[in-house]
Interface confidence: medium
């Protein structure tokens, strides 16, 4: 997290706000609900209280405007700048302005007013932008999904550094951004994508370019807004410029940023029995056109060319790949080796000699 220079903050805990005008995109009650919910994000974790005024001067004046709207920080039409807010202080201090050239919604369409407002009110309270891609105060808008919003830990640490903790946090689970060099790190899924490696963990993935050591961290939804926050397995089919992503009983086919029509599909359409609730890992072999799908202690082999599950499957993981354990969290193939991830450990398995040749920490893939 980052606070503003000179640690600008309010010297009182009871703050007022006023909604000066409304966007035509939403009903008045939807707008009021979004702002109330956005303030609650911050009051839940601090001693701050927010009271709405219907007229007069409030600490935080909220308005919608377009282009030049009276503060010499003009908006820019659709997309680009969405909103801005002033840090704590007199006059403009704390005020939040929203660009009415955007389409404001209470859903995933357009820009979600609650999410943008919660971010802007962070500025109104004294938080600058964060470098943590998982933080609400990260400067890039990402719709985080319909489920109950949880303020990330980075933002909690930031706001509490200014105002201290509240009496009781009604939602004490604050998601932490994974630390790639945590020795206990386990991974959810790994796939190549157009020459890069995507390493999934919780609602994030690291993107690793072959010539680089530093992996970039992204929210999965910043790449693919329609995907679930977390995924179970992934593999690339390079000759078709597709990747396949699995979550629960569903899977998606993606071409770059775009989901193919007709997806998601059910994993049972691949020929998996109905009892299989999820795929834990998947890896595709371009030379044979086969894909291994792991679930529980079993492995299936799918023929991607003929779109049929191979006979004699499922088989036990321990029988086909002795020594790697009875589950696979994530897997990928490179230069004749399969890399199996099981908890904080990865096994380098030689296809040619059919045995484990190295055991390494899982996060050595991230150069830790």
């Amino acid at each position: 997290y980052n606070v503003f220079p000179r640690t600008l903050k309010w010297s009182k805990m009871n703050l007022t706000y006023r909604i000066v005008n409304y966007t035509p995109d939403m009903t008045h009650s939807e707008v009021e609900k979004a702002f109330k919910k956005a303030f609650k994000v911050w009051s839940d974790v601090t001693p701050l209280n927010f009271t709405r005024l219907h007229d007069g001067i409030a600490d935080i004046m909220i308005s919608f405007g377009i282009k030049e709207h009276g503060d010499f920080y003009p908006f820019d039409g659709p997309s680009g700048l969405l909103a801005h807010a002033f840090p704590p202080g007199p006059n403009y201090g704390g005020d939040a302005h929203f660009d009415d050239d955007e389409t404001w919604t209470s859903s995933s369409k357009g820009y979600n007013l609650f999410l943008v407002a919660a971010h802007e009110f962070g500025h109104s309270l004294g938080l600058d932008h964060s470098k943590d891609p998982g933080a609400l105060m990260f400067p890039i808008y990402t719709y985080t999904g319909k489920s109950h919003f949880m303020l990330p830990d980075d933002d909690v640490q930031g706001i509490q550094s200014l105002y201290g903790p509240g009496d009781e946090d009604p939602n004490p689970k604050h998601p932490k951004t994974p630390d790639k060099c945590d020795p206990s790190l386990s991974l959810d899924a790994i796939t190549s994508l157009r020459g890069e490696t995507m390493i999934f963990k919780d609602r994030f993935f690291w993107r690793l370019h072959p010539q680089q050591v530093d992996a970039e961290l992204f929210l999965t939804k910043s790449f693919w807004p329609e995907l679930p926050n977390r995924i179970d397995a992934a593999y690339e089919h390079p000759s078709h410029d597709l990747i396949f992503i699995f979550r629960g009983r569903k899977f998606w086919a993606l071409n770059g940023y775009d989901i193919l029509e007709g997806y998601p599909k059910k994993i049972s359409e691949l020929g998996l029995p109905k009892e299989v609730k999820k795929i834990s890992a998947a890896v595709h072999f371009e030379d044979t056109g086969k894909t291994l799908l792991f679930s529980g202690n079993q492995v299936w082999r799918y023929d991607d060319t003929n779109h049929i599950m191979d006979k004699d499957y499922p088989r036990l993981i321990e029988e086909d790949f002795p020594g790697i354990g009875d589950k696979v969290d994530a897997v990928y193939e490179k230069n004749g080796y399969i890399y199996f991830f099981n908890g904080p450990i990865q096994f380098e398995y030689s296809i040619w000699s059919n045995r484990i040749v190295r055991v390494m920490p899982a996060n050595s893939i991230l150069w830790c």
């Epitope: 659709p78 997309s79 890039i140 808008y141 990402t142 992204f218 910043s222 790449f223 807004p225 410029d241 071409n255 770059g256 940023y257 775009d258 193919l260 029509e261």
Partner: nanobody, 114 residues
């Protein structure tokens, strides 16, 4: 319905630069990812670069660090700035909106030769 028209191709010497443009008709351009693909004679079409609705970029390994993709939604236009061009970059470059099942331009020829 989105129509795409590429421009900016031509003959350039190795080490030179070109900027391709992709002009889209229709106001929905900003709702689609924008991608550039290329096809060299006798070869398969291959992905070059992509930019998402949220302006996150993605490049083929062979062009990363040399090519830059960008978009200007207010002008309904996408761009591909190509620097340090090599003979192996010679191909017809196609603009795409919305991925493989989306919309395609007719292509513009880029020839890198001394």
């Amino acid at each position: 319905e989105v129509q795409l028209v590429e421009s900016g191709g031509g003959l350039v010497q190795p080490g030179g630069s070109l900027r391709l443009s992709c002009a889209a008709s229709g106001s929905t351009f900003s709702r689609y990812s924008m991608n550039w693909y290329r096809q060299a004679p006798g070869k398969q079409r291959e992905f070059v670069a992509g930019i998402s609705v949220g302006r996150i970029t993605n490049y083929a390994v062979s062009v990363k660090g040399r090519f830059t993709i960008s978009r200007d939604n207010s002008k309904n236009t996408g761009y591909l700035q190509m620097n340090s061009l090599r003979p192996e970059d010679t191909a017809v470059y196609y603009c795409n909106a919305g991925g493989l099942q989306g919309y395609w331009g007719q292509g513009t020829l880029v020839t890198v030769s001394s």
